[in-house]
């Protein structure tokens, strides 16, 4: 029977008695930098290319004793995972292997960098189709290496790693901190985070999904038939650098940014239990677990969006945090998010030619989250309006004025550290949908796109006392950018958008004594684009 | 023994390679910083990536490597380029000893330096 | 090409040892092992055992276990197949073929076992 | 006794479609995705026409296609040609070794 694994992975029309969806991989090389590897074992005979490159420190213990299988053990089995011929992902895909870690399974980040650097000339010397590397090591936070994977990126490849083994935040590791790589955590056959000993899968703001990652059946280095079941965010990327693959052979001119706005959408929600995360890194951390597309073509008419956190601020009066989108997508709108309510909202603004999002905090807050909306949208012009506050009117409104822009999202800043106090609702879209109205004491930003067939519209949901969270989602077809709250209330702790549902936390009232009138209102900004809809359809 | 003679013949190019052209001052208002691994124990002193700035070619990061040498050697250390990064980053790795990192942090297109540190399998 | 070329045919009596020759080219050796196949006259395929060019690792076949031995000599992309005690029943055509998947064929050497 | 079982016989006329079939269990050809089957003309040594199930290599004709289900594969060649008139043997992994079918003679009419 298929492996749990597998069967996770792969959307229910291609399940029968085994796992073969369509085109393997087959034109996408993989790059794997790990240990040596057993290149004939028989899962992975003929799929696996050994380069000369191996970079490796030498074994810590003057006993140590080289066994070739256990040397090999560790890259054996994830190049299995990725395109063995019974239990891997991508069974088309071929695969080159570097040696960048030791018998034991360390490594030095000045290997990794000279590995990642012969990759780069690899593809110099010889173009080939896409590329897709796996990093399924990590080490301490290290600027050099996210720094070379950022480049690497930029050159067109993308890099899949590994989240860690640490139970921790995953901003704290390299590559897995690296915002052009996608990180992955690991969970196990009953969605549940993955359990390593003490440890277990890393978590948090740079995860971006996690996939199966416990009792994952592979290729064993102790004979050339033998399989054996291993665990950890290794197993978990080498998933995810399989079905990359897939995709890439699908539709090979994806590029990074759409890969991975594929890789969310396509990806089960909401599986996995959050209870097992600490708490202040739930709301962080992705609750994604990777799956292939039910399609190997199409999904090209959607409009993609994905949640971008920023790192904490810190909790001085002036602190900052920002969040930014990847170089090919959109910021379509731009929320905060504080544990104590403090904060003085977020703005969208200029930073090296490109928009970001920056929220602010409050004098006594403990720090504020940015939180970016981030899409594709091919061809699209984005701009933000902005209005001082009004002061002597009921409140700040600014619209998207120029013919053919649409709103895509509603920023609201503040300078006074409460407007609790002030009762004027703020970021009030309704009326007029291309207008976003504020507390007269804020200033308010408009994101104000036009792009080809773009249509959006306002969805609200109120309930009449803060009671935690309130939420709002988009309809089938439609895709949220934007997501935030009304009123501007000390009640409310943030608004950001989870997968296409907009949650606007508050305060609970039992803890605050507020009154009916106070209510809680989460407004969606929900849009889709009928021109890419409609250039789909004429694919067809 | 082989590895000691290694470094000895280094040391003795870096004398030589020594040229009063190289002596150019780093740029002004721009501080080359340092990193390491906040893990204590996976940090591996005594090897350092120095990276440098973007735009920085071959050649420079070459030469910069060996100035880096040759003022190493006129102070008595001995330093071993282990490798010169280029097509990703620019930059060089040297292993050599942590006294002299305020010296190379003060080398021009230095942009910053980082202590390796160990990867682990995961 | 990818080549698999074998050393000639013998002849043998019962009870002595044959050793077939398998020279490699073309490819990356360690990337396949290379699998042994006999096909007595007017018979089948039999699968024999398994070497591996990468680190001499070996997988016979429990009918021959005991009787066999692969070898390789990497520094001449070859490797060899001893059959031991040979029996009249051990005639026939011998294959060496590129990995478990065997997509590349040796042009077979005869073995004949006659007293 | 061969580990898979094949007819031991099968022909068609040329232009025909002709199956061959391949019967193991679920520890062999039910068990893995590597059913592999070769041509073998007299003399000659086998040649390799597909791989894992339903894959062909290069140079071999698109008339020949292979599929599986359950524990048994199958072997079909379409357009059947005169040149086509061979043994037919399947092959499989087990858990730790590789079993062939007894082979199928297959004459073209």
């Known amino acids: 029977s298929i492996p749990w694994n597998l069967e996770r992975i792969t959307p229910p029309r291609y399940r029968a008695d085994e796992y073969q969806p369509p085109d393997g991989g087959s034109l996408v090389e993989v790059y794997l930098l790990d240990t040596s590897i057993q290149s004939d074992h028989r899962e992975i005979e003929g799929r696996v290319m050994v380069t000369d490159f191996e970079n490796v420190p030498e074994e810590d213990g003057t006993r140590f004793h080289r066994q070739a299988s256990k040397c090999d053990s560790h890259g054996t089995h994830l190049a299995g995972v990725v395109s063995g011929r019974d239990a891997g992902v991508a069974k088309g895909a071929s695969m080159r292997s570097l040696r960048v870690l030791n018998c034991q399974g360390k490594g030095t980040v000045s290997g990794t960098l000279i590995g990642l650097e012969f990759i780069r000339k690899s593809q110099l010397v010889q173009p080939v189709g896409p590329l897709v590397v796996l990093l399924p090591l990590a080490g301490g936070y290290s600027r050099v290496l996210n720094a070379a994977c950022q480049r690497l990126a930029r050159a067109g490849v993308v890099l899949v790693t590994a989240a860690g083994n640490f139970r921790d935040d995953a901003c704290l590791y390299s590559p897995a901190s690296a915002p052009e790589v996608i990180t992955v955590g690991a969970t196990n056959a009953q969605d549940q985070p993955v359990t390593l000993g003490t440890l277990g899968t890393n978590f948090g703001r740079c995860v971006d999904l996690f996939a199966p990652g416990e009792d994952i059946i592979g290729a064993s280095s102790d004979c050339s038939t033998c399989f054996v079941s291993q665990s950890g965010t290794s197993q978990a990327a080498a998933h995810v650098a399989g079905i990359a693959a897939m995709m890439l052979s699908a539709e090979p001119e994806l590029t990074l940014a759409e890969l991975r706005q594929r890789l969310i959408h396509f990806s089960a929600k909401d599986v996995i239990n959050e209870a097992w995360f600490p708490e202040d890194q739930r709301v962080l951390t992705p609750n994604l677990v990777a799956a292939l597309p039910p399609s190997t073509h199409g999904a090209g008419w959607q409009l993609f969006c994905r949640t971008v956190w920023s790192a904490h601020s810190g909790p001085t009066r002036m602190a900052t945090a920002i969040a930014r989108c990847a170089p090919d997508e959109e910021l379509l709108s731009c929320s905060s998010f504080s544990r104590s309510g403090k904060r003085r909202g977020e703005r969208m603004e200029a930073q090296g030619g490109k928009l970001v999002c920056r929220a602010h905090n409050a004098f006594g807050g403990e720090g504020v989250y940015a939180i970016a909306r981030c899409c594709l949208l091919p061809q699209a012009n984005c701009s933000v309006h902005t209005a001082p506050p009004a002061e002597a009117s009921m409140g700040t409104r600014v619209h998207c004025h120029q013919q053919g822009h649409v709103l895509t999202g509603c920023s609201s800043h503040w300078e006074v550290e409460d407007l609790g106090t002030h009762k004027p609702p703020v970021l009030r879209p309704r009326g007029q949908p291309n207008q976003c109205v504020g507390h007269r004491e804020a200033s308010i930003h408009a994101s104000c796109c036009h792009a080809p067939g773009l249509e959006c519209k306002v969805k609200e949901h109120g309930i009449p006392a803060p009671q935690g969270q309130v939420t709002v989602a988009c309809e089938e077809g439609w895709t949220l950018t934007g997501c935030s709250a009304l009123p501007g209330t000390s009640h409310v702790l943030g608004a950001y958008a989870v997968d296409n549902t907009c949650v606007v936390r508050s305060r609970d009232v039992s803890t605050t004594g507020s009154t009916s009138e106070e209510a809680v209102t989460a407004v969606a900004i929900c849009c889709r684009s009928r021109h890419l809809a409609q250039a789909s359809q004429e694919l067809q | 023994q082989e590895d000691e003679d290694g470094d000895y013949e280094e040391l003795v190019l870096a004398l030589r390679s020594e040229e009063d052209g190289l002596a150019e001052a780093p740029e002004h208002g721009t501080t080359a910083t340092f990193h390491r691994c906040a893990k204590d124990p996976w940090r591996l002193p005594g090897t350092y990536v120095v990276v440098l700035k973007e735009e920085t070619h071959l050649s420079q990061s070459e030469r910069t490597a060996r100035r880096l040498q040759a003022q190493a050697a006129r102070r008595g250390y001995l330093t071993k380029i282990l490798h010169v990064f280029h097509g990703l980053l620019p930059g060089f790795l040297v292993k050599m000893s942590g006294d002299l990192l305020e010296l190379a942090l003060k080398l021009p297109h230095v942009d910053y330096i980082e202590e390796d540190s160990s990867v682990f399998a995961q | 090409q990818v080549q698999l070329v074998q050393s000639g045919a013998e002849v043998k009596k019962p009870g002595a040892s044959v050793k077939v020759s398998c020279k490699a080219s073309?490819?990356?050796?360690?990337?396949?092992?290379i699998s042994w196949v006999r096909q007595a006259p007017g018979q089948g395929l039999e699968w024999m055992g398994w070497?591996?060019?990468?680190?001499?690792?070996?997988n016979y076949a429990q009918k021959v276990q005991g009787r066999v031995t692969m070898t390789t000599d990497t520094s001449t992309s070859t490797v060899y197949m001893e059959l031991r005690s040979l029996r009249s029943d051990d005639t026939a055509v011998y294959y060496c073929?590129?990995?478990?998947?065997?997509?590349?064929w040796g042009q077979g050497t005869t073995v004949t076992v006659s007293s | 006794q061969s580990a898979l079982t094949q007819p031991a016989s099968v022909s068609g006329s040329p232009g025909q479609s002709i199956t061959i079939s391949c019967t193991g269990t679920?520890?062999?050809?039910?068990?893995?995705?590597?059913v592999s089957w070769y041509q073998q003309h007299p003399g000659k040594p086998p040649k390799l026409m597909i791989y894992?199930?339903?894959n062909r290599p290069s140079g071999v004709s698109i008339r020949f296609s292979g599929s599986k289900s359950g524990n048994t594969a199958s072997l079909t060649i379409s357009g059947l040609q005169a040149e086509d008139e061979a043994d037919y043997f399947c092959?499989?992994?087990?858990?730790?070794?590789?079993?062939f079918g007894g082979g199928t003679k297959l004459t073209v009419l």
């Open positions: 894992e199930v339903s």
């Open positions: 073929a590129r990995g478990y998947g065997m997509d590349v």
């Open positions: 073309g490819y990356t050796l360690t990337s396949y092992g």
């Open positions: 070497i591996s060019f990468y680190n001499g690792n070996t």
């Open positions: 092959s499989s992994y087990t858990s730790t070794s590789m079993v």
């Open positions: 679920s520890s062999d050809v039910g068990g893995y995705n590597s």
